[in-house]
Amino acid sequence: SERCDDWGLDTMRQIQVFEDEPARIKCPLFEHFLKFNYSTAHSAGLTLIWYWTRQDRDLEEPINFRLPENRISKEKDVLWFRPTLLNDTGNYTCMLRNTTYCSKVAFPLEVVQKDSCFNSPMKLPVHKLYIEYGIQRITCPNVDGYFPSSVKPTITWYMGCYKIQNFNNVIPEGMNLSFLIALISNNGNYTCVVTYPENGRTFHLTRTLTVKVVGSPKNAVPPVIHSPNDHVVYEKEPGEELLIPCTVYFSFLMDSRNEVWWTIDGKKPDDITIDVTINESISHSRTEDETRTQILSIKKVTSEDLKRSYVCHARSAKGEVAKAAKVKQKVPAPRYTVELACGFGAT
C-alpha cells in the first residue's frame, strides 16, 4: 500500500467513557490535524476508515460494524457505541484515504467502570465558581449530539452520592445546576445523569465534574507584600548569613499570572556577581488565594553587600508593587569592660 501520513498516537486526546453508556467519538483528523472538514473530504471522494488495536495487543483489526442492535456504528466522522463494553478499551485509528491520498491518526479510548456513587478513574473537569458572587451555573457537559432536540431527556443531579433536591443554595434546573450564592461547602463532585429514549431503548449518560469555589473578583486586590516591611531591620555583621523573606499575598484571579522577584541594586540576582540563592514556596487558601514566599539568602555577607538595596517586587493582573528591605551593618558593641578597667586603674 502507498505511503500514508501517520500522525501517530494522539495521547493528548485520552478519551475516557463510562461502561454501558453511549459514546460518540469524532475522528480527531478533522479537529486537530487537517485543514478541511469531513463534508469537504467526503465530497472530494475520500473515504473514512476505522480500525482498532485491543488493549495489550499489537494486532490492528477492523471494527465490527455488524454487531447486534448496531452496537458500534459510524456516522459521518463519528464512531458510535450504543453502548460501550469494558473490552472496547484500546487504540482506535481513523484513516482518510483515496487512491492518491492517505492520512491517519490513532487515539486511546478507555472504557471506565463507575460505582454507585459515580466514583471512577475518570479524569474530572474542574469548574470554578466565585464565592458569594451572583447566581452561577454549571451545565451538564458533553451531551450534545446524543439525541435530537425533539427528545426531552430527564436529568438528575447528584452531589457526591446524593441526589440534589433543593439543599442550602443549589437548584437543579434541567441541564443546568444553579448556585444562588456559592459557598465553600459547595466544593465537591457533581454528577448529572441524562436519561433519554432511542429506538425503544433507554440510555444513560453520566457526567461528573468538580466544583471549586474560589475568591471573588469583587474582593480581589493588588498583591500585598507582608514582608519585607518597615518594622523589621536585617542587621548583620560581615561573614554572617543574610536571609530576607519576601512574602506576598495574591487574591485569586482567574487566569492571572502571579510573579514575585527580588532586585539587588536594581538588578535581577542572576545579573549580579554576588553568591545569592533564592528559594520559593507557595501556599493556597481554601478559595485559592495564593501566598508566595521567596527567601533571598547570602551565605557569607560582606560589608559591601550590607550597603546594597534589596527590593521585593510582586505583580498580578491587579497591579504591581515593590518594597525595600531594611538592611544595615551591625555596629560592634563598645568594649565597656576594658574602659572600666582603665578607669578603675586611674583612681
Epitope: G134, C161, Y162, N166, N168, N169, L183, I184, S185
Partner: antibody, heavy 119, light 112 residues
Framework: EVQLVESGGGLVKPGGSLRLACAAT????????MSWVRQGSGKGLEWVGR??????????DYAAPVKGRFTISRDDSKNTLYLQMNSLKTEDTAMYYC??????????WGQGTLVTVSS | DIVMTQSPLSLPVTPGEPASISCRSG???????????LAWYLQKPGQSPQLLIY???NRASGVPDRFSGSGSGTDFTLKISRVEAEDVGVYYC?????????FGQGTRLEIK
C-alpha cells in the same frame, strides 16, 4: 432518602437542662446548614437558631429569647445535630424540630421531639 | 428583626374553589443576587411543616402544580388554583434574608 430523627425531649423543671439530638441520613450532613425550629402547643413556628457547615465557618446564630441559654453544635462524624438547653423556662415548652437548609427555606424537617418545662 | 404579616388568619374554602394567602414583610426580601428570600410551608394537622415554595415562586419537589407563589420585595402571595380536602392545615410564610429567620403568624385553611 433524607431522614431527620430528633430525640432527647421530655419533662423538665424550670431552671433545668435538656440536650436534644437530631440524627441525619440520606445526604452529606457536613455540607449542610442545620437549624432548630420550635412550636408551642397551638402556636406558630419560631426559629431557635442555626449552625453553618464547618466549611462555611461553622457560625452559629440564635433567636433572642434563647441566646445565652441554648447552645447548638454538630458532630459531622456522627451526622448529628445537638441543642443543649440550659436554664429552661416554662415558655420553652414546645415541639422542637430540626431542619436542613436556609436560603431556599427549610427543605426537610424531622418529626419533632416534645419538651415540657413544668414544676 | 423582619416582621412577617399574613392575611387572612383564617380561610374557609369550598373544595374546587381557588384560595389566596397574602404575606407582607417589614422590609424587602430581595437579595442582592436577584432572588426573593421567601418560603411557604404547609403544616397539616399532627404533622411537621412541609416546604411548598422557595425563593418566592419556585415549587419544591413533589408539590402539586395547583400551588403557586408570586410577588417580590415586600408583598407575596400563595395561590391554590383548586383547593382539595388534603390541603387543609396551617400555611406559613418565612423569610431567610437575614437572621433571626422569622415566620408569619400562620393562615388556617379549612374546608367549608
Amino acid at each position: 432518602e433524607v431522614q431527620l430523627v430528633e430525640s432527647g425531649g421530655g419533662l423538665v423543671k424550670p431552671g433545668g437542662s435538656l440536650r436534644l439530638a437530631c440524627a441525619a441520613t440520606g445526604f452529606t450532613f457536613s455540607n449542610v446548614w442545620m437549624s432548630w425550629v420550635r412550636q408551642g402547643s397551638g402556636k406558630g413556628l419560631e426559629w431557635v437558631g442555626r449552625i453553618k457547615s464547618k466549611a462555611d465557618g461553622g457560625t452559629i446564630d440564635y433567636a433572642a429569647p434563647v441566646k445565652g441559654r441554648f447552645t447548638i453544635s454538630r458532630d459531622d462524624s456522627k451526622n448529628t445535630l445537638y441543642l443543649q438547653m440550659n436554664s429552661l423556662k416554662t415558655e420553652d415548652t414546645a415541639m422542637y424540630y430540626c431542619t436542613t437548609g436556609e436560603l431556599l427555606g427549610f427543605d426537610y424537617w424531622g418529626q419533632g421531639t416534645l419538651v415540657t418545662v413544668s414544676s | 428583626d423582619i416582621v412577617m404579616t399574613q392575611s387572612p388568619l383564617s380561610l374557609p374554602v369550598t373544595p374546587g374553589e381557588p384560595a389566596s394567602i397574602s404575606c407582607r414583610s417589614g422590609q424587602s426580601l430581595l437579595h442582592s443576587n436577584g432572588f426573593n428570600c421567601l418560603a411557604w410551608y404547609l403544616q397539616k394537622p399532627g404533622q411537621s411543616p412541609q416546604l411548598l415554595i422557595y425563593l418566592g415562586s419556585n415549587r419544591a419537589s413533589g408539590v402539586p402544580d395547583r400551588f403557586s407563589g408570586s410577588g417580590s420585595g415586600t408583598d407575596f402571595t400563595l395561590k391554590i388554583s383548586r383547593v382539595e380536602a388534603e390541603d387543609v392545615g396551617v400555611y406559613y410564610c418565612m423569610q431567610t434574608l437575614q437572621t433571626p429567620i422569622t415566620f408569619g403568624q400562620g393562615t388556617r385553611l379549612e374546608i367549608k
